[in-house]
């Protein structure tokens, strides 16, 4: 089945924004909301925000979770408020990161 094509006047949703891209804002408006988790060198990074352009979110949202990154996407006002992205498997300890507790 073919991917759903973006509408000419796509609906925009209000999303919770928490992370590096947000500046002083706590929300953003986009065609999709997301909640993400990535692990860098034992450092857990949780962020929330929005994809303002359909194509921008299309690839990211369809990427299956990996041991180091997971993104959950949704459509609907504030739909990412109570979503916390989870990794598919229990994290493995990285070399030299004994100070960090990994899930």
């Amino acid at each position: 089945m073919e991917d759903e094509k973006p509408k000419v006047n796509p609906k925009l949703y209000m999303c919770v924004c928490e992370g590096l891209s947000c500046g002083n804002e706590d929300h953003c408006e986009g065609q999709q909301c997301f909640s993400s988790l990535s692990i860098n060198d034992g450092f857990h990074v949780y962020q929330k925000g929005c994809f303002q352009v359909y194509e921008q979110g299309k690839m990211t949202c369809k990427t299956p979770p990996s041991p180091g990154q997971a993104v959950e996407c949704c459509q609907g006002d504030w739909c990412n408020r109570n979503i916390t992205a989870q990794l598919p498997t229990k994290g493995k300890s990285f070399p030299g990161t004994q100070n960090f507790h990994l899930e």
């Epitope: 992370g19 590096l20 860098n40 450092f43 857990h44 949780y46 916390t84 030299g96 100070n99």
Partner: antibody, heavy 117, light 111 residues
Framework: QVQLVQSGAEVKKPGSSVKVSCKAS????????ISWVRQAPGQGLEWMGL????????NYAQKFQGRVTITADESTSTAYMELSSLRSEDTAVYYC??????????WGQGTLVTVSS | DIVLTQPPSVSGAPGQRVTISCSGS????????VSWYQQLPGTAPKLLIY???KRPSGVPDRFSGSKSGTSASLAITGLQAEDEADYYC???????????FGGGTKLTVLG
């Protein structure tokens, strides 16, 4: 909007300890790392360490290892930085900041700690 | 313990373009993201650039970041009087498991 509000200025004697608090409001507290950074008068930024509240474990800069303790209280959404064996060189403004690995997005207003006999 | 190297000062006239360099090593900038901060006198640092080249919402596009190998740079175009501040680069160091900063660069807007 995420806000980090720090405790007030402190004057301490050499050899004593200081504990600075950083209360977060807005957003989720437990899932985000908090870094502590200090700035001596007229000097640059110096990273001291961080805590990931969800896991309760901290990571410290080698320079401060054994002298700094960073903790977090999830029930009050507050992070703490305690520095012991204070000396005059520890006189600085101490900042807490939300750390996202790729950068620090939200900063507290800073707490001036003066160490003087 | 300054690990990243920045020039102590740069200057430029209003409207001009200035760049601030930040040099590190393979254990930090070479393998990790670089972020840039602006600090106005008496205030907390403010995030200008994250993930090497991305701008947070609200930061003017006059500010841009780039990275090549173990060095990074911040460019400011259309210099304005309010850009006069201290600028710091930062990265995560894989060897020391710590965040590292540059010594800071004081930007002076002439005239």
């Amino acid at each position: 909007q995420v806000q980090l509000v720090q405790s007030g200025a402190e004057v301490k004697k050499p050899g004593s300890s200081v504990k600075v608090s950083c209360k977060a409001s807005g957003g989720t507290f437990s899932t985000h790392a908090i870094s502590w950074v200090r700035q001596a008068p007229g000097q640059g930024l110096e990273w001291m360490g961080l805590i990931q509240p969800r896991f309760g474990t901290a990571n410290y800069a080698q320079k401060f290892q054994g002298r700094v303790t960073i903790t977090a209280d999830e029930s009050t959404s507050t992070a703490y930085m305690e520095l012991s064996s204070l000396r005059s060189e520890d006189t600085a403004v101490y900042y807490c900041a939300r750390d996202y690995y790729g950068g620090m997005a939200y900063w507290g207003q800073g707490t001036l700690v003066t160490v003087s006999s | 313990d300054i690990v990243l190297t920045q020039p102590p000062s740069v200057s430029g006239a209003p409207g001009q373009r200035v760049t601030i360099s930040c040099s590190g090593s393979s254990s930090n900038i070479g393998q990790n993201y670089v972020s840039w901060y602006q600090q106005l006198p008496g205030t907390a640092p403010k995030l200008l650039i994250y993930d090497n080249s991305k701008r947070p919402s609200g930061v003017p596009d006059r500010f841009s970041g780039s990275k090549s190998g173990t060095s990074a740079s911040l460019a400011i175009t259309g210099l304005q009087a309010e850009d006069e501040a201290d600028y710091y680069c930062s990265s995560w160091d894989l060897l020391s498991k710590s965040r590292v900063f540059g010594g800071g660069t004081k930007l002076t807007v002439l005239g």
